[in-house]
Each structure stands twice: as structure tokens, then as C-alpha cells.
């Protein structure tokens, strides 16, 4: 097979015919050295998935449920291109499965037992698989057959296409459970009508259903959405209140050697030549031979799925949970209102050791999961492999964009006992230089810079945001002659100054000696001209406070701060000489785990927090000899957020705006994936 060929998998005679037409028309518009199409015919989508895994084919377009099958071992396929619907300006690649109720009713998601339910149809995503999958562990046992368990959970339902003879309760609201539009409560509009007519108490539909059926906002305002955290929101807030986000139709390929760039090149060219309203002789998104062949007829085009986005992230935690529950039929033995152990995400082996020690001391209430970078940890929390971690504000922003929520803030200045309930204002991001140098904020060009890591607040977002507004471009590696900014491209001048050791050189974790606040300061001491750190860094590492060989003889007076007005001040004067105020680090978690994480951490800090005085023979949560492992070492306590419980509210408008501006320069693959 020529390496430029994409072997498309077709699942019927009609699809194979369209595939051949696709192949021939692409040949006529693409250069001979461009991508080409070959067609492989299989009996089913599952056979196509197996064929791609076995390298007998390269690509196929699948519905969400099949993307899940494709992702499971041993297939290990991943999404590479998404169909989009709607306009090019506002492309929709996902829809949201929602639970709609009337505003004048008074129950929540966890009070659905005994209510009347309206469904789009048996086995359908938004109307059955997702809601029933998520409710699965609340269904009465035995849970098989599933229809019987659902019939016993709700007091009456309309589930079009269900067997009304065996499960009459599922057809109580629509006698016969008709499987076509002859049943007035069939499909999306029908399920909504079932709610609207007062037959049912809740309708499981997609987010657009209510807008398609009620053009008038005043009418829509009579309805609300049930959220998974047992609150309600208005129908326009579906992005923050849904049962799951469901990808519409997706091209999948092998995770390794999957030709994803070639597939994108092919489909991008195909949509240019044969997309909506492009050509009379061949149309990608329709066919005289049948409906939805190879691609959905309703699709308007294709979007490349960001490379960081694997199937778990693409399908989303809620969707995977629902489908896994339905498929595997397993439920935790503990009641769902009881907190399971919290899986903490640790960065590399240094944090992992501290986490293990915490795990032992917590008697297993804390478990540990590891990742090599902060972004990998955030991804693990998103997909349920981990539950929580403490993050610098820059990563709180990324985590927030990825759907995680802040749970508790690290406090650095408030003494106990008021600490837990105090909202601190934040710390100062500063630029530190050697007293002996003649540097100012205005003559940093061509100098050697030391950063905590790319994407972090004091070390990157604040100084580079200020720099960007001055130089109006993102080529920071050209502005400084060299530097160490862990997380930069390995061949960048901003990795040149890093310490390593070798395989870990410039990695954004503790294996890189110049990582983090202490590492950036060490970089200044040993090699650099300026370090971007927090205002406490110099005092914490001078005057013998850090016993490491490189730091033990350092004096505070040998370092000064750069002020934005071009002057310099003593490190004792950060309030009058800083780059900006930075939000404190904060613990983040998935919404569904936030309460458990908060309860457990408040309990853990009472045992292992700053009230422990002897850390040489006792476990201390906020101590790691200046390494800031798991938490910053200067943390006094973890504090409640009260109403600052979203990333925007926590970080504040000014900081969010600054980071959003800097997104033009973003090198965050995770942020790209989460904003897809």
C-alpha cells in the first residue's frame, strides 16, 4: 500500500459505491504525489474498527457509541477528524445530552426515583444510554433486564421502541411505544412534547431540542435543566449543566502509525472540492445511493481533532461513565453518597514518594497517581484516573477551561485558627536580579532568563504577558538570548540554560533541577541574569534556610527586585516593586468529586497541616525542604473558597484577561484540546 494512500472502510454496498466515487473524484483534483483514497469493504462498523486496528484499513467515521468501542483495548483507536454541523463560523462538533424539567417542579437529579420519564427512544444516546447509564447504580436490583429495572425506578415512562408487552410501564405515557413519528412522543421533539403536555416530569433530550421546539424565550423560561451536582440551571446554561457532552460523528484511526496528518490532508482537500455547495458531480455530504453514507448528510465540514485529545478526553468522563455502566453493569459496593479514597496526582517520582508517604499516613484515604507533566495530571483528573491536585494559577486556568473546578486555596499569610475561612489576596510575582548587575525592567532584551515553567503564573504568564504587550509578538526565545523555561520546546533557546540531568532536561517537573520557584532562583544564582518567581522565593532560599550546597551560603542582600517603572528595590519591598499580584495556588478536582475532596483535605490538614511542629519525625503535608512537592512549602493551610468556586471567580477578571491575551502565544496542547 503506498504510504500516501488512505484506506477508507465502507460498511455496505452503497457505502462502497460512494467510496469508489470519492476515490475517483479525489484522484481528479489532487496532484499525483498527494493523498489518495482506497476502499475496503467490511460487514459492520465493528469489523471496520478491527480492520483499522489490524492495519488492514486506515479510517472510518463512527457515532459516539462506536468511538467508545474503537477506543477500548485491543483496538486502541483515536479520534482524528470531527464532522461539524451548523456554520463554519460557529461549528458544532458536539451536542449535550440534557434532562429537562418544568420550572415549577421541585426535584433534583438524585430525586428522580418515582417520577415519570420521557425518552427519545430505546438504546438512543441522549434519550436512553446516557441518562440510564448515569442512573444505573441507583436502579433497583436486579438490574437485568435493564428495561425492567428502569420500569421499577420510574413510576411511568414513554420509551419509544421498547417492548410494551414485556415492560408495560415503559409505555404507560405512550401506549404501544410506537417506534416512528406516528407516536406523538417519539424522538427528540416527541420526548419534549411528553414533558410539555404534562405526561412526564422529566425529558431526556439534547440541548438544542428545547430551542427547536420553543422559539419564544418566555416559553423556554418555563423550563430548567437538571445538573449532575443536584442543582438546576436555565436552559441556556447547557454547557455547565448537562448529563454528557456527546461527539456527533468522528473519523478514527490507529493511535500509533495512524496516518492522522494524511487523513486530515485528504479530508481537508475533499471538503474544499466536494463539500457543501461545492460541486455538482460529487458531494461528500450527500448521495443518490442512500442516507448518511461514509459521512452524515447533515455535516457541513470537517475539523482536525487536536493531537492531545485522546478518545477518553474526546468522549468525556460522563459519557464514558454512562456507557461503561451500561456495558459492564458493575456498581461500587459502597453507597454512592459515601466518599471513596481521593486519588492525588503526583508529578514525577519526587512528588510520588511524598504522596505515598501521605497515603500511608492517611491509612489509604489518599491514593496516588503519577504523571510526568502538570498537563498530563490535569488530563488524568478529567478522565477519572485521578481526582485532585494543587495547581499554580496558570494551570488553574487551563484546568478550568477543561471543566475542573477549584476546591480549596493554599493560604500563605494567614495564621491559624482563622486560616481555613480566610480568602487571601494572593502573592506577588517578581523579577529578581543580582545586586551586582545593572539590569532594569527596560533592558532585559538579550539577557538570560530563568522561569518556574511555561504556563505558570509568576514564572511565565505575568512576565511574558507584560512582555507581549511591549513587543507584540510571541517569539520570547528571541527576546532573551537564552534561558530555562521548563516545558519549552527542547530545541528552543529557552531550554539552553536548563540543568537536567539529560533525559529530563527542560521537563516541567522536579526532575529538572531548575524547575519551579527554587529551581528558577537556582538558575539565576548559577547561570542567569533574571529570575521570574514569587516574592517569597529569595527570603526562603537565603540566610541558610535552604541547606542544599548551592544555596546554603547565599545572602538576601545580594539580590534585588526589578520594578516596572525601571527602578530596583530590596527583596523586602515586594509590595512596592512587583510585576503583578498572582492568585494563590489552588486544589482542583472534577465537579462530581469536589465535595469529597474538600471534606477529606480539611480533615487531613487537621492531622498533618502546619500544626505539626516536628517534620523530621512526623509526616507534614506542607513540607518538602524547599521543593514545593504536592503543595507550596510555605502553605499555612488550605482555605475554603466560599463563593469563589469557579476558575473565573477564583482567578479574578484581570488575571483571566491577561492569560486569555497570552493564549495567542499558547504552547499548551491540553488547552487546545479543551477548547476544541
Amino acid at each position: 500500500v503506498p504510504e500516501k494512500s488512505v484506506r477508507w472502510c465502507a460498511v455496505s454496498e452503497h457505502e462502497a459505491t460512494k467510496c469508489q466515487s470519492f476515490r475517483d473524484h479525489m484522484k481528479s483534483v489532487l496532484p499525483s504525489n498527494g493523498p489518495s483514497v482506497a476502499c475496503v469493504k467490511k460487514a459492520s462498523h465493528l469489523d471496520c474498527i478491527r480492520a483499522i486496528a489490524a492495519n488492514e484499513a486506515d479510517a472510518v467515521t463512527l457515532d459516539a457509541g462506536l468511538v467508545y468501542d474503537a477506543y477500548l483495548a485491543p483496538n486502541n483507536l483515536k479520534p482524528v477528524v470531527a464532522e461539524f454541523y451548523g456554520s463554519k463560523e460557529d461549528p458544532q462538533t458536539f451536542y449535550y445530552a440534557v434532562a429537562v424539567v418544568k420550572k415549577d417542579s421541585d426535584f433534583q437529579m438524585n430525586q428522580l426515583r418515582g417520577r415519570k420519564s420521557c425518552h427519545t427512544g430505546l438504546g438512543r444516546s441522549a434519550g436512553w444510554n446516557i441518562p440510564i447509564g448515569l442512573l444505573y447504580c441507583d436502579l433497583p436490583e436486579p438490574r437485568k433486564p435493564l428495561e425492567k429495572a428502569v420500569a421499577n425506578f420510574f413510576s411511568g415512562s414513554c420509551v419509544p421502541c421498547a417492548d410494551g408487552t414485556d415492560f408495560p410501564q415503559l409505555c404507560q405515557l405512550c401506549p404501544g411505544c410506537g417506534c416512528s413519528t406516528l407516536n406523538q412522543y417519539f424522538s427528540y421533539s416527541g420526548a419534549f412534547k411528553c414533558l410539555k403536555d404534562g405526561a412526564g416530569d422529566v425529558a431526556f433530550v439534547k440541548h438544542s431540542t428545547i430551542f427547536e421546539n420553543l422559539a419564544n424565550k418566555a416559553d423556554r423560561d418555563q423550563y430548567e435543566l437538571l445538573c449532575l451536582d443536584n442543582t438546576r440551571k436555565s436552559v441556556d446554561e447547557y454547557k455547565d449543566c448537562h448529563l454528557a457532552r456527546v461527539p456527533s460523528h468522528t473519523v478514527v484511526a490507529r493511535s500509533v502509525g495512524g496516518k492522522e496528518d494524511l487523513i486530515w490532508e485528504l479530508l481537508n482537500q475533499a471538503q474544499e472540492h466536494f463539500g457543501k455547495d461545492k460541486s455538482k458531480e460529487f458531494q461528500l455530504f450527500s448521495s443518490p445511493h442512500g442516507k448518511d453514507l461514509l459521512f452524515k448528510d447533515s455535516a457541513h465540514g470537517f475539523l482536525k481533532v487536536p493531537p492531545r485529545m485522546d478518545a477518553k478526553m474526546y468522549l468525556g468522563y460522563e459519557y464514558i461513565t454512562a456507557i461503561r455502566n451500561l456495558r459492564e453493569g458493575t456498581c461500587p459496593e459502597a453507597p454512592t453518597d459515601e466518599c471513596k479514597p481521593v486519588k492525588w496526582c503526583a508529578l514525577s517520582h519526587h512528588e510520588r514518594l511524598k504522596c505515598d508517604e501521605w497515603s500511608v499516613n492517611s491509612a489509604g484515604k489518599i491514593e496516588c497517581e503519577s504523571a510526568e507533566t502538570t498537563e498530563d495530571c490535569i488530563a488524568k483528573i478529567m478522565n477519572g484516573e485521578a481526582d485532585a491536585m494543587s495547581l499554580d494559577g496558570g494551570f488553574v486556568y487551563i484546568a478550568g477551561m477543561c471543566g475542573l473546578v477549584p476546591v480549596l486555596a493554599e493560604n500563605y499569610n494567614t495564621p491559624n485558627p482563622n486560616c481555613e475561612n480566610t480568602a487571601e489576596e494572593g502573592y506577588f510575582a517578581v523579577a529578581v536580579v543580582k545586586s551586582s548587575s545593572d539590569l532594569t525592567w527596560d533592558n532585559l532584551k538579550g539577557k538570560k532568563s530563568c522561569h518556574t515553567a511555561v504556563g505558570r503564573t509568576a514564572g511565565w504568564n505575568i512576565p511574558m504577558g507584560l512582555l507581549y504587550s511591549k513587543i507584540n509578538h510571541c517569539r520570547f526565545d528571541e527576546f532573551f538570548s537564552e534561558g530555562c523555561a521548563p516545558g519549552s520546546e527542547k530545541n528552543s533557546s529557552l531550554c539552553k540554560l536548563c540543568m537536567g540531568p539529560s533525559p529530563n532536561l527542560c521537563e516541567p517537573n522536579n526532575k529538572e533541577g531548575y524547575y519551579g520557584y527554587t529551581g528558577a532562583f537556582r538558575c539565576l544564582v548559577e547561570k542567569g541574569d533574571v529570575a521570574f518567581v514569587k516574592h517569597q522565593t529569595v527570603p526562603q532560599n537565603t540566610g541558610g534556610k535552604n541547606p542544599d550546597a548551592w544555596a546554603k551560603n547565599l545572602k538576601e542582600e545580594d539580590y534585588e527586585l526589578l520594578c516596572l517603572d525601571g527602578s530596583r528595590k530590596s527583596v523586602q519591598e515586594p509590595a512596592n516593586c512587583h510585576l503583578a499580584r498572582a492568585p494563590n495556588h489552588a486544589v482542583v478536582a472534577r465537579k462530581d468529586k469536589a465535595d469529597c475532596v474538600q471534606t477529606l483535605l480539611l480533615d487531613q490538614q487537621r492531622m498533618f497541616g502546619s500544626s505539626v511542629t516536628d517534620c523530621s519525625s512526623n509526616f507534614c503535608l506542607f513540607e518538602s525542604k524547599t521543593k514545593d512537592l504536592l503543595f507550596r512549602d510555605d502553605t499555612v493551610c488550605l482555605a475554603k473558597l466560599h463563593d469563589r468556586n469557579t476558575y473565573e471567580k477564583y482567578l479574578g477578571e484581570e488575571y483571566v484577561k491577561a492569560v486569555t491575551n497570552l493564549r495567542k502565544c499558547s504552547t499548551s496542547p491540553l488547552l487546545e484540546a479543551c477548547t476544541f
Epitope: N361, N510, F619
Partner: nanobody, 117 residues
Framework: QVQLVESGGGLVQPGGSLRLSCAAS????????MAWYRQAPGKQRELVAG???????NYAGSVKGRFTISRDNAKNTVYLQMNGLKPEDTAVYYC???????????WGQGTQVTVSS
């Protein structure tokens, strides 16, 4: 700094038992948490079991109910009693005292445990 020496490993059949010992050159009484780790070829080192000074214990899910960790502060020794051994328990077992404070890689030699018929 306390030096630790692991012993007691060996070749054992599936279902068999072994008792590993970890002897400290100094007093472990003042050390809060002691733990056993293991590393199988090509795999990451993982926590097997840990014990605090007050006797709180914690075990990896895969060994719960089969392994028991204990410590004798008077003898400056930590033990790992391993029952119902399985082939997947094959690894080098290391003892650590966490007083190294998380960022030095000075692990001991370890003791090899091989479970095979």
C-alpha cells in the same frame, strides 16, 4: 542518616510465603513512616505497604489481605510477611524510611523475590 539493608528474598512457588526484613543501622523509633516498595523488570517502582510510627498501615490493592507490614522499633527492623504469593509479585523489594525527604535517589540494594513453579 539511617542506612537500611533488606533481606529475606528468594525463589518460592505460587501460593508460598516469605518474610522480608529491613534492618536499620540507626534508630528507626524517631522515623515516622517506613515502607516497602517493589520494582519488576521494565516497570515503575511501586508502593507495596507502609507503616507509621503509631502503627497505621496501608497496602497496595493488589497485596491487600495477603501481605502484612510490621515494625519492631526496639530491633530497628521493619518486616513484610508475604503469603499467597503470585507470579506477578516477582520483583526486587526495597525498604525506605522517607526521612530522605522525597528528592534523593539513594535506594538500597533491595532483595529479589521470584515466584515461579
Amino acid at each position: 542518616q539511617v542506612q537500611l539493608v533488606e533481606s529475606g528474598g528468594g525463589l518460592v512457588q505460587p501460593g508460598g510465603s516469605l518474610r522480608l526484613s529491613c534492618a536499620a543501622s540507626g534508630s528507626i523509633f524517631s522515623i515516622n513512616t517506613m515502607a516497602w516498595y517493589r520494582q519488576a523488570p521494565g516497570k515503575q517502582r511501586e508502593l507495596v505497604a507502609g507503616i507509621t510510627r503509631s502503627g497505621t498501615t496501608n497496602y497496595a490493592g493488589s497485596v491487600k489481605g495477603r501481605f502484612t507490614i510490621s515494625r519492631d522499633n526496639a530491633k530497628n527492623t521493619v518486616y513484610l510477611q508475604m503469603n499467597g504469593l503470585k507470579p506477578e509479585d516477582t520483583a526486587v523489594y526495597y525498604c525506605t524510611d522517607y526521612s530522605r525527604r522525597y528528592y534523593q535517589d539513594d535506594w538500597g540494594q533491595g532483595t529479589q523475590v521470584t515466584v515461579s513453579s
